[in-house]
Amino acid sequence: CKAMHVAQPAVVLASSRGIASFVCEYASPGKATEVRVTVLRQADSQVTEVCAATYMMGNELTFLDDSICTGTSSGNQVNLTIQGLRAMDTGLYICKVELMYPPPYYLGIGNGTQIYVIDPEPCPDSDF
């Protein structure tokens, strides 16, 4: 397994609708045709696998139908969007990129993007 550099923003604030987007950029050492992107979340001692997508260079990322993630790719950049976030989902979201094909296998892990999620205040009842 060979190492590869992955860059991602340090901090992102989710929108009031619970949507957060960030770019994950990897320094591809070769001409990979099959790339796998995984989003991991770390909060204290818990590390969970949030979502993953494999794509062929030049094609769209495909996440599972029930995934909370969507994304697009452009060259060595992946634009990731995570939706349905609530305050309890605040944490460090790590971008992991694997060049699956052709060999050799490369692995790159970003330093993580701290996503802050603030639940919107409920609208006060208004009398008309």
Epitope: S45, Q46, V47, E49, L107
Partner: antibody, heavy 120, light 106 residues
């Protein structure tokens, strides 16, 4: 070379407590979570919980809350799991385990296991 | 919690024949991870992130699947493959392992 060396087998009486140790070497102890897994005789593997040695924050499987307590001693690079109020159902081999890389190759390293026997 | 059910519970295979172990999750998981355990030994990481072979694992092994259904396959079983195989998920806590599949050689 990463090594996780656990304390030896224990025989305890019902109601007693036991503290199992896991001495880590070959890496920076505070860089990786330490997880604990139980295997009862002839049974599958059961995740007990884990501890972040840096922050000492813990996460437990609800099933083991109140039964297991995870701690670390950073000065000796040792993780501990204490089991309280032992009963026959706690007879098992207990393993400590660590990931291969940060965020990759989960549970790549395992201790040799510690057999805990409960007998009156 | 996510329950992982493995099938079959045990299988007996002749050397050189293929073998397949399934792991079904009670809800969708991102990846499945596999461990091999031999009697009296600690489990060993065997396949992680669904399809990546751990260091030293022969390429007769492969892993595949997505969502709730995952498979570990051996193209040609050898004597050293005997043992119990467990699947594991890391999509949500508590982390859970499968029920285990014992592979024996005929």
């Amino acid at each position: 070379e990463v090594q996780l060396v656990q304390s030896g087998a224990e025989v305890k009486k019902p109601g007693a407590s036991v503290k199992v140790s896991c001495k880590a070497s070959g890496y920076t102890f505070t860089d990786y979570n330490m997880d604990w897994v139980r295997q009862a005789p002839g049974a599958s593997l059961d995740w007990i919980g884990n501890i972040n040695p840096n922050s000492e924050s813990t996460s437990y499987n609800q099933k083991f809350k109140g039964k297991a307590t995870l701690t670390v001693d950073k000065s000796t690079s040792t993780a501990y799991m204490e089991l309280s109020s032992l009963r026959a159902g706690d007879i098992a081999v207990y393993y400590c385990t660590r990931d291969g890389n940060r965020y990759d190759a989960w549970f790549a390293y395992w201790g040799q296991g510690t057999l805990v026997t409960v007998s009156s | 919690q996510i329950v992982l059910t493995q099938t079959p519970l045990s299988l007996s295979v002749s050397p050189g024949e293929p073998a397949s172990i399934s792991c079904s999750a009670s809800s969708s998981v991102t990846y499945m991870h596999w461990f091999q355990q031999k009697p009296g030994q600690s489990p060993k990481s065997w396949i992680y992130s669904t399809s990546i072979l751990a260091s030293g694992v022969p390429d007769r092994f492969s892993g595949s699947g997505s969502g709730t259904d995952f498979t570990l396959k051996i193209s040609r079983v050898e004597a050293d493959d005997a043992g119990v195989y467990y699947c594991q998920q890391r999509t949500s806590y508590p982390l859970t392992f499968g029920t285990g599949t014992k592979l024996e050689l005929k």
